[in-house]
């Protein structure tokens, strides 16, 4: 598993929509992966973890004086849609092929 | 204060001496970068424009934080500063220097 | 439309302080760079100073340490403060927008340093 | 610093001239060159930036060229309001510099 020690990286999280109270919406699935972005952004920043101008100043400024400014994060930097079926405003059943922003395809230091 | 802590944008100025790019940035001295500083508690905000991903994430921090961690306090939007640069030795002017200053922070 | 406008006094006493305030409209600070350059009577034009749009500052060494420029982006403002004044540095003083090029001037506030 | 020579200091010509004016820097600045005209009483106006791209609103007959040291500024067919002093500035390194301006007269 990525710690706190290891480069960031995509994680495994199971979501199970009971644990957070969404299964009041969500027919189905009742759990998929989520996925997590863990993981430090170390100094050099590797290309993999796409990291911004700012990203990679922020780096450096915090390789030199730490107490300064704090790491850049390890963030999902682009996402990947979920089928689900849920409930609509109505109460009706409605399956929703493409449910955006549900899962970490990418993660990136930001 | 918890509100205090929460995720916002506060100041943080750049010399580029002191990372080592006065090399080859040869103007400005230095700029405003701004950092994204504090927490991202459950519920969260509207103005820091969060995913359903970082809802998520921050529901199950909430129910249990072994299992996730919080979402993090990140630029979500970037802002161009000028600058007069080295260029492979030609000095070039860029009106636009894309992703250096942080214009929005938010949970993600 | 683009304004860039000075505001300051038209005489200064000798060793005195000048302070002259660039008032922009039409465009924002933390976008375009705003510097300040003077004209003496019958001379060249001479450049101060810049405020970058990142908020970075350069100077002319030549004005050494006598110089100090800031802004108030909320007001859309840019400082020029200048000490111990001397009659060389009777001019008109200009804030000029930079993107590509001094592309838009204020009309100028000439200064006249007096004893 | 780097020092703008400006060539000549005056010039004298006729309506429907071809004239150029000089501007050489002590050290190379690459294209980051542009040209001023300014006209007593007003604020100095923007003719060219980075050496050769002509201003919005700028007649073509204003044609500016170089790279590194040498820059110049062409007008191909003077007019009676063009009978004024031009200024060069090199921004590529700090502090920006002006040459010391070209006055264009009728001869």
């Known amino acids: 598993s990525a710690g706190a020690g290891s480069h960031c990286q995509k994680t495994s999280l199971r979501v199970n929509f009971e644990d957070i109270g969404w299964d009041s919406w969500i027919i189905a699935p009742k759990e998929y992966e989520a996925y997590e972005c863990k993981g430090g952004c170390f100094f050099p920043l590797a290309d993999d973890v796409t990291p911004t101008k700012h990203a990679i100043v922020q780096t450096l400024v915090h390789l030199k004086f730490p107490t300064k400014v704090g790491k850049a994060c390890c963030v999902p930097t682009k996402l990947s849609p979920i089928s689900v079926l849920y409930k609509d405003d109505m109460g009706v059943p409605t399956l929703k092929y493409h449910y955006e922003g549900m899962s970490v395809a990418e993660c990136g230091c930001r | 204060n918890a509100k205090g802590n929460y995720c916002k944008r506060t100041p943080l100025y750049i010399d580029f001496k002191e990372i080592g790019w006065d090399s080859w940035i040869i103007a400005p001295p230095g700029y405003e970068a701004y950092e994204c500083r504090g927490v991202c508690n459950y519920p969260l905000a509207e103005h820091l424009t969060p995913t359903k991903h970082a809802i998520i994430q921050a529901l199950v921090h909430l129910k249990n934080s072994q299992k996730a961690s919080k979402a993090c306090c990140v630029p979500t939007k970037l802002e161009p500063i000028s600058i007069l640069y080295l260029d492979k030795g030609v000095v070039t002017y860029k009106f636009k220097y894309e992703g250096m200053a942080v214009s929005e922070c938010g949970c993600r | 439309q683009v304004q860039l406008k000075e505001t300051g006094p038209d005489l200064v006493q000798l060793t005195q302080t000048l302070s002259i305030t660039c008032t922009v409209s039409?465009?924002?600070?933390?976008?375009?760079?705003v510097h300040w350059v003077r004209q003496p009577p019958g001379k060249g034009l001479e450049w101060m100073g810049a405020m970058w749009n990142g908020g970075g500052i350069n100077y002319n060494s030549a004005f050494k340490s006598r110089l100090s420029i800031s802004r108030d982006t909320s007001k859309s403002q840019v400082f020029l403060k200048m000490n111990s004044l001397q009659t060389d540095d009777t001019a008109k003083y200009f804030c000029?927008?930079?993107?590509?090029?001094?592309?838009?001037w204020g009309q100028g506030v000439m200064v006249t340093v007096s004893s | 610093e780097t020092v703008m020579t400006q060539s000549p200091t005056s010039m004298s010509t006729s309506i429907g001239e071809r004239v150029t004016l000089n501007c050489k820097a002590s050290q190379s600045v690459g294209i980051n060159v542009d040209w001023y005209q300014r006209t007593p009483g007003q604020s100095p106006k923007l003719l060219i930036h980075?050496?050769?791209n002509r201003h919005t609103g700028v007649p073509d007959r204003f044609t500016g060229s170089g790279f590194g040291r040498d820059f110049t500024l062409t007008i191909s067919n003077v007019e009676a309001e063009d009978l004024t002093i031009y200024y060069c500035l090199q921004y590529g390194s700090i502090p920006l510099t002006f040459g010391a301006g070209t006055k264009l007269e009728l001869i």
């Open positions: 980075g050496a050769s």
């Open positions: 039409g465009f924002s600070l933390s976008t375009y760079n």
């Open positions: 000029a927008r930079f993107g590509y090029g001094f592309d838009y």
